[in-house]
């Protein structure tokens, strides 16, 4: 008869993740291995699971060497794999005869997977006493939650390391523009985004730049996370008496400024740099739905 | 809302110094030269000084030039002029001003009287 | 120094004329700016780049005018237009103002 050397463990993991579970089993002959599933429903029966079953997401790869293994794995894990995974073993030549009963019965282990799906998350933004609040609820949780984060633009603005189902953000007034994202942790418990409206958050690539006589300078400006996007970009350079002269594109084709915009960024390339004119502080200017904001970028110009 | 409020005006004896302040809120204040402008009773608009993006330059009228001392701390969004050696023609109102070449933007105004 | 010369220093108006107040510039600027004072309160940007009128300007003001030569107009005078106007220029140091000009309501 065969015996297991190795069990497959139960495990509990994200929905869109993956699963592998191990078998291994002795017998002689080499036993054969199968694996079996049977879903969490009531009404649910046992089928068995072969090579690229359920749209080619499971797998099984078997050795049958001085013992026999097997692992079974099952990708981009969905609710409807939740369920008990069985390994079967054994080593009568009989076991699959169409017509003849097996003498010696299968060996079964089992394990229990549990798909864990994200929580659903109400989103709300509040303006509570001249502040902007963001808040998040969420509406359960198949594992214990260990904090929060919010972030946006890739930065973390808050973290925090209590258990409850909703967390909240306090927006900088001054600075509100942007999609945040309020994160519970473990990470994959439940994740929203909230899409704050202001005027355009940008930032300069440098605050100055240093050029040749001769050369060309390229001053950047970025948008940092603003939302509604950036639809216009202007540039600007100062006057010793604040002036401001618009600055677009040369219609030539080796014109001295050539300005290219997307709604994340401004270049100004500003060619054959003269030391007497082009010297001073450049402002770019992004317009979204919600305002205008601007940076300012210095160039000085070294002569020859 | 760009909002420019004035504060530190007053009585002065002549010779004697007095700082202004402006706090700037509503805009991005580090990104705009800002200036003083002045109006001595009954009379006309008069340009003191400016600071450009930055303060690495300062410009004044010749009558201020080694009294006043114009300045900026863009953390805090506040404009300064300190003025030394107060004189009687001093005697205005002092408006903190953004500019663009033009001055966009005025504060109330706040009074300096120099008299003894 | 550039000065700036306003003209007339006082103009009395009636309700409904057009009225038209100038600045002249000693020597060429590229534009000019108007300011709006009412007593006892601070000034206001009313007209920028020669033409353009500043946020929340009646359009019955209009800006003109090039080089050494420029005019503020009134198409039709209202009440609340009585103030006194300034003309600025910003091409250079020192920044100047005209004398200004108080129109009155006759």
């Known amino acids: 008869a065969a015996g297991f050397l190795k069990a497959p463990l139960s495990q509990e993991r994200w929905a869109g993740g993956s699963v592998v579970l191990h078998c291994e089993a002795v017998g002689s002959p080499i036993p054969e291995i199968q694996w079996w599933f049977e879903g969490n429903a009531p009404n649910d029966s046992c089928s068995q699971l072969w090579d690229g079953a359920r749209l080619d997401r499971v797998h099984i790869h078997a050795a049958y060497r001085q013992h026999a293994a097997s692992s079974l794995s099952v990708d981009g894990l969905t609710a409807e794999d939740t369920g008990t995974y069985e390994c079967r073993a054994s080593s009568d030549p009989d076991r699959n005869h169409l017509t003849r009963p097996p003498r010696v019965k299968w060996v079964r282990a089992q394990a229990s997977v549990v798909v864990l799906e994200p929580g659903t998350i109400q989103t709300s933004v509040q303006e509570v006493n001249s502040k902007t609040q963001l808040t998040c609820s969420l509406n359960s949780s198949g594992v214990d939650i260990v904090g929060h984060r919010w972030m946006r633009g890739g930065k973390v603005l808050q973290e925090d390391t209590l258990p409850d189902l909703h967390t909240k953000y306090i927006v900088d007034a001054d600075d509100r523009s942007g999609e945040y994202s309020c994160i519970f942790l473990p990470e994959p418990v439940g994740r929203s985004e909230i899409n704050v409206e202001g005027p355009p958050r940008i930032k300069v690539g440098k605050k100055s730049e240093h050029s040749s006589e001769g050369e060309l300078a390229k001053l950047v400006c970025k948008s940092d996370a603003s939302y509604p996007p950036i639809t216009d970009w202007f540039w600007f350079k100062t006057s010793d008496t604040g002036e401001e002269e618009a600055i677009t594109n040369s219609t030539e084709a080796n014109g001295k400024y050539v300005v290219v915009s997307t709604p994340e960024k401004s270049q100004l390339t500003i060619s054959n740099l003269d030391v007497n004119v082009d010297p001073g502080t450049y402002v770019c200017n992004a317009t979204n739905a919600q305002g205008t904001t601007r940076e300012t970028i210095s160039l000085r110009v070294r002569s020859r | 809302e760009v909002q420019l409020v004035e504060s530190g005006g007053g009585l002065v004896l002549p010779g004697r110094s007095m700082k202004l302040s402006c706090a700037a809120s509503?805009?991005?204040?580090?990104?705009?030269?800002m200036a003083w402008v002045r109006q001595a009773p009954t009379k006309g608009l008069e340009w003191v000084a400016s600071?450009?993006?930055?303060?690495?330059?300062?410009y004044y009228r010749d009558s201020v030039m080694g009294r006043f001392t114009i300045s900026r701390d863009d953390a805090k969004s506040t404009l300064h002029l300190q003025m030394d050696n107060l004189r009687s023609e001093d005697t205005a109102t002092y408006y903190c001003?953004?500019?663009?070449?033009?001055?966009?933007?005025w504060g109330q105004g706040v009074m300096v009287t120099v008299s003894s | 120094e550039i000065v700036l010369t306003q003209s007339p220093a006082t103009m009395p108006a009636s309700p409904g004329e057009k009225v038209t107040l100038t600045c002249r510039a000693s020597?060429?600027?590229?534009?000019i700016y108007w300011y709006q004072q009412k007593s006892g309160t601070s000034p206001k940007l009313w007209i920028y780049?020669?033409?353009k009128l500043a946020s929340g300007v009646p359009n019955r003001f209009s800006g003109s005018g090039s080089g050494t030569s420029y005019s503020l107009t009134i198409s039709s005078m209202e009440t609340e237009d009585t103030a006194t106007y300034y003309c600025?220029?910003?091409?250079?140091?020192?920044?100047?103002f005209g004398s200004g000009t108080k129109l009155e309501i006759k």
């Open positions: 001003v953004r500019l663009r070449g033009y001055f966009d933007y």
């Open positions: 509503g805009f991005t204040f580090r990104t705009y030269y």
């Open positions: 600071i450009s993006i930055g303060g690495d330059n300062t």
């Open positions: 020597s060429s600027i590229r534009y």
């Open positions: 780049d020669t033409s």
């Open positions: 600025q220029q910003g091409r250079s140091y020192p920044l100047t």
